[in-house]
């Protein structure tokens, strides 16, 4: 069972909902984006891998007051099975490289889509 | 309330193109996931495709490569096209309601039948 | 895709019957199942969901019972209303899929 706290769910759903769910947050933040993203702030990029859940999270999480990604952040915490907090960085494999959030955020919605394409849900 | 209502041509050539569209009343289509869903006759029901609130869509597999779905907002309305038909798409199309996070059709057009025949 | 297989295929009751409707999915579906109805002519209508929720407006002799893979339909005393095709719908993982249907017929 998925199961994302705060307002994002009402409840468990099945993994692929949730997929949905996150993939069509993602696209309301890339349509509605007027001035930059989290006033273009960087964050890790991230191995589109196993563990990507966990590590985007743990990438994005290290965003504070940007409102428009709140709600992906709780939305990727149903997903990722241990409490992520800032500044820890147990899933991010490769810190190497810090691109802007509104890049993060394109790269990991052209991933999930293609994940749901592929019915990879889990 | 939201109510669904579909409309279209009821007979198709072979080989054409199916163009059907759902009006939706009551609510905005601007929220939740718009779907097809089709009942060939005597048969069971198959799921088509829907588009979301945002305008994205997903398409079933085995049939994603005949498929577009679109919408108008400023009408409230989707549409469904589906190329290259034959006799085997022929059956009764509902368009259906599916309100976020959830997974079941809680609300469905009467339908309406499409035979495709030369 | 996951395939959904009901049985029986068709059923002849006769009011105040008690009857049993089963759905089984080819691969562990939790409880992401849903019941419909549908008459002749008409759009089908959703009756339950998550295997065991009625819908809104649904009388409560419809139930619904299972998880992983084997789910169950009853309903506790048929009335006049309820001969129709009943059908079960996966939500797991797309595509959604539906079950063949159950007709129940007036014995």
């Known amino acids: 069972l998925t199961c994302l706290g705060g307002f994002a769910s009402p409840g468990p759903v099945p993994p692929s909902t949730a997929l949905r769910e996150l993939i069509e947050e993602l696209v309301n933040i890339t349509q509605n984006q007027k001035a930059p993203l989290c006033n273009g702030s960087m964050v890790w990029s991230i191995n589109l891998t196993a563990g990507m859940y966990c590590a985007a999270l743990e990438s994005l999480i290290n965003v504070s007051g940007c409102s428009a990604i709140e709600k992906t952040q709780r939305m990727l915490s149903g997903f990722c099975p241990h409490k992520v907090s800032a500044g820890q960085f147990s899933s991010l494999h490769v810190r190497d490289t810090k691109i802007e959030v509104a890049q993060f955020v394109k790269d990991l919605l052209l991933h999930l889509k293609k994940l749901f394409r592929e019915g990879q849900f889990n | 309330e939201v109510q669904l209502q579909e409309s279209g041509p009821g007979l198709v050539k072979p080989s054409e193109t199916l163009s059907l569209t759902c009006t939706v009343s009551g609510g905005s289509i601007s929220s939740d996931y718009w779907n097809w869903i089709r009942q060939p006759p005597g048969k069971g029901l198959e799921w088509i495709g829907y588009i979301s609130y945002n305008g994205n869509t997903y398409y079933n597999p085995s049939l994603k490569s005949r498929v577009t779905i679109s919408r108008d907002t400023s009408k409230n309305q989707f549409s469904l096209k589906l190329s290259s038909v034959t006799a085997a798409d022929t059956a009764v199309y509902y368009c259906?309601?599916?309100?976020?996070?959830?997974?079941?059709?809680?609300?469905w057009g009467q339908g309406t039948t499409v035979t495709v025949s030369s | 895709d996951i395939q959904m297989t009901q049985s029986p295929s068709s059923l002849s009751a006769s009011v105040g019957d008690r009857v049993t409707i089963t759905c089984h999915a080819s691969?562990?579906?939790?409880?992401?199942l849903s019941w419909y109805q549908q008459k002749p002519g008409k759009a089908p209508k959703l009756l339950i969901y998550?295997?065991?929720d009625l819908h809104t407006g649904v009388p409560s002799r419809f139930s619904g019972s299972g998880s992983g893979t084997d789910f169950t339909l009853t309903i506790s005393s048929l009335q006049p209303e309820d001969f129709a095709t009943y059908y079960c719908?996966?939500?797991?993982?797309?595509?959604?899929?539906f079950g063949g249907g159950t007709k129940v017929e007036i014995k």
């Open positions: 691969q562990n579906i939790n409880v992401w």
């Open positions: 719908q996966q939500g797991q993982s797309y595509p959604y899929t």
């Open positions: 259906a309601r599916l309100a976020k996070w959830t997974w079941y059709f809680d609300i």
């Open positions: 998550k295997a065991s």
